[in-house]
């Protein structure tokens, strides 16, 4: 089951996922002047079994002027160093990201990828928030949101984070003391949000699902 709508927006804060649950989809988007190759995939899909998850399909971009020339899918390590990281990429990924069962890591960049990533999240996905540069966390509740299924509808929990305009930034999990457990958080939403969205994916793993979208922008 995929999530409806976007995770909540918090003023002066951005969010990202540390790992992606199986079923998550990522648009294959190319930067300006490049286009997805005609035979190329529209989306990458996080799939897997009990022991291993990975991204199916490959995103490939080609120059808009040269329609038949495909670009390599995954840059070499040197090229990856040159590429800008996602908007909230921490210097060190949390240790448990790679070993989290049923989750995929952040997909590697592909050459001439667009400057934003568009994700379609599944129920159970957690995203983490931090204040943007120049703001600091004033209220330190759990700074995450989880996509939950309630009364047959999906909803995102409300992160307990307020960002105030002082020159200090909060960090992602793994870069500071752990915050309160999500289970212990007060839920700000009590009603069932009617926010459903069709999602049809033709794979062995899914038939008709529901979806949400997340756009991250690189700095």
């Amino acid at each position: 089951e995929l999530c409806d709508d976007d995770p909540p927006e918090i003023p002066h804060a951005t969010f990202k996922a540390m790992a992606y649950k199986e079923g998550t989809m990522l648009n294959c988007e190319c930067k300006r002047g490049f286009r997805r190759i005609k035979s190329g995939s529209l989306y990458m899909l996080c799939t897997g079994n009990s022991s291993h998850s990975s991204w199916d399909n490959q995103c490939q971009c080609t120059s808009s002027a040269t329609r038949n020339t495909t670009k390599q899918v995954t840059p070499q390590p040197e090229e990856q160093k040159e590429r800008k990281t996602t908007e909230m990429q921490s210097p060190m990924q949390p240790v448990d990201q790679a070993s989290l069962p049923g989750h995929c890591r952040e997909p590697p960049p592909w050459e001439n990828e667009a400057t934003e990533r568009i994700y379609h999240f599944v129920v159970g996905q957690m995203v983490y928030y931090q204040c943007v540069q120049g703001y600091r966390a004033l209220h330190r509740g759990p700074a995450e949101s989880v996509c939950k299924m309630t009364h047959g509808k999906t909803r995102w929990t409300q992160p307990q984070l307020i960002c105030t305009g002082e020159m200090e930034t909060s960090q992602f999990p793994g870069e500071e003391k752990p915050q309160a457990s999500p289970e212990g958080r007060p839920e700000s939403e009590t009603s069932c949000l009617v926010t459903t969205t069709d999602f049809q994916i033709q794979t062995e793993m899914a038939a008709t699902m529901e979806t949400s979208i997340f756009t991250t922008e690189y700095q």
């Epitope: 709508d5 648009n27 994916i201």
Partner: nanobody, 126 residues
Framework: QVQLVESGGGLVQAGGSLRLSCAAS????????MAWFRQAPGKEREFVAA????????RYASSVKGRFTISRDNAGNTGFLQMNSLRPEDTAVYYC???????????????????WGRGTQVTVSS
Amino acid sequence: QVQLVESGGGLVQAGGSLRLSCAASGITFNDHTMAWFRQAPGKEREFVAARDWSDIITRYASSVKGRFTISRDNAGNTGFLQMNSLRPEDTAVYYCAAREGGVVAGVRSGAPYDYWGRGTQVTVSS
């Protein structure tokens, strides 16, 4: 010259139905994602629905889910938006849009769409 032309708008009573059409020329719908947006007076443009040509993803705004259905006739290069159980708050100008990539929806989703129609007015009276 790419053109998207919407039709099918009009005045309808609350609870009624309308079927919007979007005829495309200059592009083939069988390799473009098609979407519908709307803009009510004094409000920002709002995502309504989108569907890619492979039918991998079909996406609706939560406010129209269960009432509106997006469909497409790739052979006829036409897209449709079936609107049932219309409400006064559905009153807006409805725009058809297309892009080469996958579905983009949600709050700032209009920018990635490459081609736009001029819109058709839908008015729902109470």
